[in-house]
């Protein structure tokens, strides 16, 4: 059953290839365990970028090798994706699942188009 999930339509990554956006969901119940997944959609292909499960009121922890970091506050999750390059430009979808207690709820955002521009290499100085 699909919850409402909101995320910005467009975000521009900074010169270091980092993009941040907020994913906000409207919880129908009193979830204690929440799972947040970032998906990248290109044409008909969907790949998982990163995922984290957290207990409400606690910090959200991604795996050590994840390109994502994040913080949570109430029904808002602040997501940061690092190490992006121009070829990573695309639609990034926030998926939220209320894992516990039942009932299970899931919501999918409309996606954030992240634009990444590779920095110009510095000219050699003599």
């Amino acid at each position: 059953k699909a919850m409402h999930v909101a995320q910005p339509a467009v975000v521009l990554a900074n010169s270091r290839g980092t993009a941040s956006f907020v994913c906000e969901y409207a919880s129908p119940g009193k979830a204690t365990e929440v799972r947040v997944t970032v998906l990248r959609q290109a044409d008909s292909q969907v790949t998982e970028v990163c995922a984290a499960t957290y207990m409400m009121g606690n910090e959200l922890t991604f795996l050590d090798d994840s390109i994502c970091t994040g913080t949570s506050s109430g029904n808002q999750v602040n997501l940061t994706i690092q190490g992006l390059r121009a070829m990573d430009t695309g639609l990034y979808i926030c998926k939220v699942e209320l894992m516990y207690p039942p009932p299970y709820y899931m919501g999918i955002g409309n996606g954030t188009q992240i634009y990444v521009i590779d920095p110009e290499p510095c000219p050699d100085s003599d």
Partner: antibody, heavy 115, light 108 residues
């Protein structure tokens, strides 16, 4: 123990109304979006209607086949959900299940539409 | 509306075997898929939610996988008690929350 008890099924003539009721216990009713799902040998499982809860302003949704004829409602104080079925058709026949989210299912109540 | 195509419609397998049931969506559904088990004369029971999560009280011999448009339910080391009809359901908005046509599993 989770329980969902549907009542109100029976034999009804085409074009006539029928109201189904479902009483829930054993879980937090007000946290659940409630559904009616029906089953017939011809169509298998078919989602019929959903009513969301207070945080979602009790929004309602219907399958195209029942839109305009069926009305789903709920009473959180009685942990109950209802399905008012008007202008019943032969194709509405089947077992009607009440579900809490899609996690909990009742035992079903049978609706027969025949002249 | 998104269509859900489940296959096979029926299958027969022996105790101890592993079987796989597939469910295809006509559009990407982002893992918004449940699987249900319905035994003869009983109500459906939630088996797998969110494509991969095992529902409480269900055997770990059941597992769900898939992404995008293609999903599958695997039942390992079949037991006689696994004889049932299995359904997938898309749980992504907007409605309808369509079910697949079902797969009837017979244990030889």
């Amino acid at each position: 123990e989770v329980k969902l008890d549907e009542t109100g099924g029976g034999l009804v003539q085409p074009g006539r109304p029928l109201k189904l009721s479902c009483v829930a216990s054993g879980f937090t009713f007000s946290d659940n979006w409630m559904n009616w799902v029906r089953q017939s040998p011809e169509k298998g499982l078919e989602w019929v209607a959903q009513i969301r809860n207070k945080p979602y302003n009790y929004e309602t949704y219907y399958s195209d086949s029942v839109k305009g004829r069926f009305t789903i409602s709920r009473d959180d104080s009685k942990s109950s959900v209802y399905l008012q079925m008007n202008n019943l058709r032969v194709e509405d026949m089947g077992i009607y299940y009440c579900t809490g989210g899609m996690d909990y299912w009742g035992q079903g109540t049978s609706v027969t539409v025949s002249s | 509306d998104i269509q859900m195509t489940q296959s096979p419609a029926s299958l027969s397998a022996s105790v101890g075997e592993t079987v796989t049931i597939t469910c295809g969506a006509s559009e990407i559904i982002y893992g918004a898929l449940n699987w249900y088990q319905q035994k003869q004369g009983k109500s459906p029971q939630l088996l797998i939610y969110g494509a991969t999560n095992l529902a409480d009280g269900m055997s770990s011999r059941f597992s769900g996988s898939g992404s995008g448009r293609q999903y599958s339910l695997k039942i390992s080391s079949l037991h006689p008690d696994d004889a049932a009809t299995y359904y997938c359901q898309k749980i992504l908005s907007p409605p309808p929350w369509t079910f697949g046509g079902g797969t009837k599993l017979e244990i030889k």
